[in-house]
Structures are given as structure tokens and as C-alpha cells.
Amino acid sequence: QSFQVNPPESEVAVAMGTSLQITCSMSCDEGVARVHWRGLDTSLGSVQTLPGSSILSVRGMLSDTGTPVCVGSCGSRSFQHSVKILVYAFPDQLVVSPEFLVPGQDQVVSCTAHNIWPADPNSLSFALLLGEQRLEGAQALEPEQEEEIQEAEGTPLFRMTQRWRLPSLGTPAPPALHCQVTMQLPKLVLTHRKEIPVLQSQTSPKPPNTTSAEPYILTSSSTAEAVSTGLNITTLPSAPPYPKLSPRTLSSEGPCRPKIHQDLEAGWELLCEASCGPGVTVRWTLAPGDLATYHKREAGAQAWLSVLPPGPMVEGWFQCRQDPGGEVTNLYVPGQVTPNSSS
């Protein structure tokens, strides 16, 4: 006898409003196998039973959440397989406040994800990003969870809000921050992003004279949330063009970090180098667009990056990583600007 369930996963995540069919079948050497689903509120028409198989149709309603069990029997032998079904809602409905940030002000940023299910802090995580890195120094205030006002009964969707107090954004300020919200489900990770532009002004308000505004810092750890083999990663970033900005380097904290130099001679070639003693290597880890489209040369403590074919460097963030240690330096290259080197 063979007993099969398709798809075979023991946990299945279904987007609200989408349908999924789970087929349970069994072959039987001695006659026809009896196969049926039990343990789910299966209203009429959601289960179709045929000789030797049974098809469970999930309609993507919250009431479909549960753990149905397929039972197959053939003579004196029986098999069963349970499937944990989780119906989720995670539309791209992020709202950020304020609409733009003002450098030099102690301010609070909020990010709200609307029409969410499940409303579980263990499933949903928020991050405040600068480029592809978590913004170091931001302080997370308490999260809020509220039920959305629904037109129809029986769909308890929620909105979840995370607020942060911002560190000093430095001078010059970065072009934008992003709120990233990640929903982690069985075998599925979903991500939405919303940009929070930073007001680029020559007359930014100064911080209170009781404080010293230090540059903002990027952590050197990746922002990927709980990504492991077998997970599908869906990222939905918003990436409008950044406003023009003079080059700005950022680095992870640490006693020694790589330096990035810009060289006009070779058609906007970037050089990353480390001078932290023997055995140190550097490599390019981030560039606007696809890093694979750039020409890279790596030689121990030095790594070059240039555009193919030779031409102006693309606007955006470039990142170089040093190993061992994992320290990174980030450089923002604007569209057309006189080159200089990182600090």
C-alpha cells in the first residue's frame, strides 16, 4: 500500500482569500482504499471524496485555520497524516509617521502594519533600516496592537504599530530610512518595506546644546530575519530614487575597519582596503542593483569595484566587509559628485 498527501508538508500557510487543495490518496492491493478527512470544520463542498482519494479545499478564510487529519485505511491497515493549516493576512499596507524626518531633532518614528493576521509578536517583527542595515542606536518603544474596524463580521484583522526613538542622524543626514515588517510563518517569510524620507535641508535644526550629535552608525550584522534552508523569501521593497547627497561613509563600531577610496582615474573605481595587521581580507558585499554586474578584483586586504562597461558609478550605497571580525564600511555615492575617501 502507498499513502500520499500532496502537498506533503505538515504545516501549510495560506494567504487569506486564496484557495489551496490538499489531496490525500491511498492505493490498496486488496480492493479500494477508504480515505477521508476529519478534524476540520469542513462545510459542504470543501471535501471531495473519490475512490482511493480525498481532496480538501481550503478557501483562505480564517475559519479554515486548524489541523485536519487525513485517514486512509486498506483492509486492517490504516494510516493518517495531519496538516496544520494557518491562514494569514499580510497585505502591503504599511503606514509610517511622520511623512519625513527632520535631521537634528529628537523624534519618534512609527510604523503601522494594517490588516494583519495572526497578530502574534512572535510571527511579526519590525525593523528600522538604513540601507540594508538595522539603524543602530534606535530605541524601540512599546508595540501596540489594535483590532481593525471591519465592514464584515467574523474577520478579526489587526493593526500592529512599532515606534522608535531615533538617534542623531548625523551630518549630512542619510537620504531615507525604511520601516521593514517581516511575517514569519511555517516555511514562509514575507517582508514589506516603506520608505521614510529624510528632509534634506541646508538649515536643519540643531540638536539641543546639552547634547553632542554624533554620526549615525550601522550595525555590521545582516538584517535578514530567521532565514534558513527551505524557507521562501518574498521581499517587497519600495525604492524611489534618493535625493542628491555628498558622499557619506558609515562604519560598524570597532577599533579597526576597512576604508573605501574613490578613484576617478579608472572610471569611478572604488578601492576598499584594510590595514589591521596580517591575515585580514576585504570583499564587497553591497552595491546598488546586482553586485554581480560589477567588476570586482579582490587581493587580500584590498578589493576593487568598478562599473562594467567603464562609466560613472551608480548612485547608492556601497558596502565593504572585512574578515575576520565582520566589520563593514558603507559609502553613499551620489549621482555626480567630486570623489573623496572614507574616514
Partner: antibody, heavy 119, light 107 residues
Framework: EVQLLESGGGLVQPGGSLRLSCAAS????????MHWVRQAPGKGLEWISY????????YYADSVKGRFTISRDNSKNTLYLQMNSLRAEDTAVYYC????????????WGKGTTVTVSS | DIQMTQSPSSLSASVGDRVTITCRAS??????LAWYQQKPGKAPKLLIY???SLQSGVPSRFSGSGSGTDFTLTISSLQPEDFATYYC?????????FGQGTKVEIK
């Protein structure tokens, strides 16, 4: 000189109320978020509430939520903690503390005022 | 909430000793960690912020290190005025939380 000075502590019966004050001097009070932190006799420090510089944001530890209210009067450079429905476990030294803008650690603390809840 | 665990809870040391106190967070707090010193009947006093930055006016024998979940406060050469209770505090996310304290006593 930057200073914080708490007042208003005392002996109160369970279920009673008290209002603590914290007078600030030596800095631009409205620029700073402020906190209340308490310490029960022989115990460690417990953060209980904060308020933003413009009073737009407040938050409370679960242990005091619904019973305590934090407020401030920037014109008087004073922080307040209204404590209602007091319990024996609220007995502690109450400190006000200043929060460092952009970095968020508590860099200046008051000397504290003692609240005793007992019948 | 993020739990902060200090060790040891108390220690006995002599003047001139090198003293190390550790603090562990239940999840990463990056470098958003402060150390405070408190003497009996007094308010806490800030020693270290951002895990390793020395607060103005604090003697250089105090130093902090660590990031993520594991942090250390070191007193390189213990002085008579250093006998006190020391607390770590994370301010990465609310509610901010303190360690239970480490009492440094005279041997």
C-alpha cells in the same frame, strides 16, 4: 549644575494616593524625556514610567499600569507621578531620572523620595 | 521583556584587585547597555553608557565591553570608594530593564 530633586513621599495606607514631584534645574527641561524608577527596600532598580519632552508619549511598567500617571509641567520644570490605589508592594524609594537625547540612557538621577504603603 | 542577568550576585575583593562583573541579556541589545554604581542610601550614578563609553567624570579604572547579549564591567584596580552595588541596564527597547545587581564588598 544639573539637578533633580524629588519630593512628596511619605506614609500612606493601602488604597490611598500620593503625588510625587521632581524639580529640575540646570538644563532645558523640555528637551528631555524623563523617567521614574523605584527601588524596594533591599531590592534592585525597577523602571516604572517615562514621559517625552512634549508629553506626547507616556508609558508604564505593567506593575503600575492603570494606577500611576506620569505628567510634567515644562513651564515649572517639574515632573510628576500621581500614584493611586497604592499597595504594600509599591513601598520603595522613587527616583526621577533624565534621559539623554539620541542615546537614551539615564544620565542624571535625583536623590530619591521614600514612599511607604502600610496600614 | 528583555531579562538582564548579572553575575556574580556579590563578591569580596581587596583594594587594588581587578574586579570583573558580567551581565547577560536574554536577547540582543546591541550596544544599548549602561552600568550604574549605587552606594547605600544614595541614588544610582552612571558609569558606562553604550556598553563601553566612560561617562564624564568617572575614573578611567572603570571600563565596559561587550555587545549583543554579553557584557562586562571591569574595575582595573579597586579603590576604597568603589565598594558599592553595580547594576547593568538595557535601554534598547521598552520596558527598559536592570540586572539584579552585584554587591562588591571588602574582603
Amino acid at each position: 549644575e544639573v539637578q533633580l530633586l524629588e519630593s512628596g513621599g511619605g506614609l500612606v495606607q493601602p488604597g490611598g494616593s500620593l503625588r510625587l514631584s521632581c524639580a529640575a534645574s540646570g538644563f532645558t527641561f523640555s528637551d528631555f524625556w524623563m523617567h521614574w524608577v523605584r527601588q524596594a527596600p533591599g531590592k534592585g532598580l525597577e523602571w516604572i514610567s517615562y514621559i517625552s519632552g512634549d508629553s506626547g508619549y507616556t508609558y508604564y511598567a505593567d506593575s503600575v499600569k492603570g494606577r500611576f500617571t506620569i505628567s510634567r509641567d515644562n513651564s515649572k520644570n517639574t515632573l510628576y507621578l500621581q500614584m493611586n490605589s497604592l499597595r504594600a508592594e509599591d513601598t520603595a524609594v522613587y527616583y526621577c531620572a533624565r534621559d539623554r537625547p539620541y542615546y537614551y540612557y539615564m544620565d542624571v538621577w535625583g536623590k530619591g523620595t521614600t514612599v511607604t504603603v502600610s496600614s | 521583556d528583555i531579562q538582564m542577568t548579572q553575575s556574580p550576585s556579590s563578591l569580596s575583593a581587596s583594594v587594588g584587585d581587578r574586579v570583573t562583573i558580567t551581565c547577560r541579556a536574554s536577547q540582543s541589545v546591541s550596544r544599548s547597555l549602561a552600568w550604574y554604581q549605587q552606594k547605600p542610601g544614595k541614588a544610582p550614578k552612571l558609569l558606562i553608557y553604550a556598553a563601553s563609553s566612560l561617562q564624564s567624570g568617572v575614573p578611567s579604572r572603570f571600563s565596559g565591553s561587550g555587545s549583543g547579549t554579553d557584557f562586562t564591567l571591569t574595575i582595573s584596580s579597586l579603590q576604597p570608594e568603589d565598594f558599592a552595588t553595580y547594576y547593568c541596564q538595557q535601554y534598547k527597547s521598552y520596558p527598559v530593564t536592570f540586572g539584579q545587581g552585584t554587591k562588591v564588598e571588602i574582603k
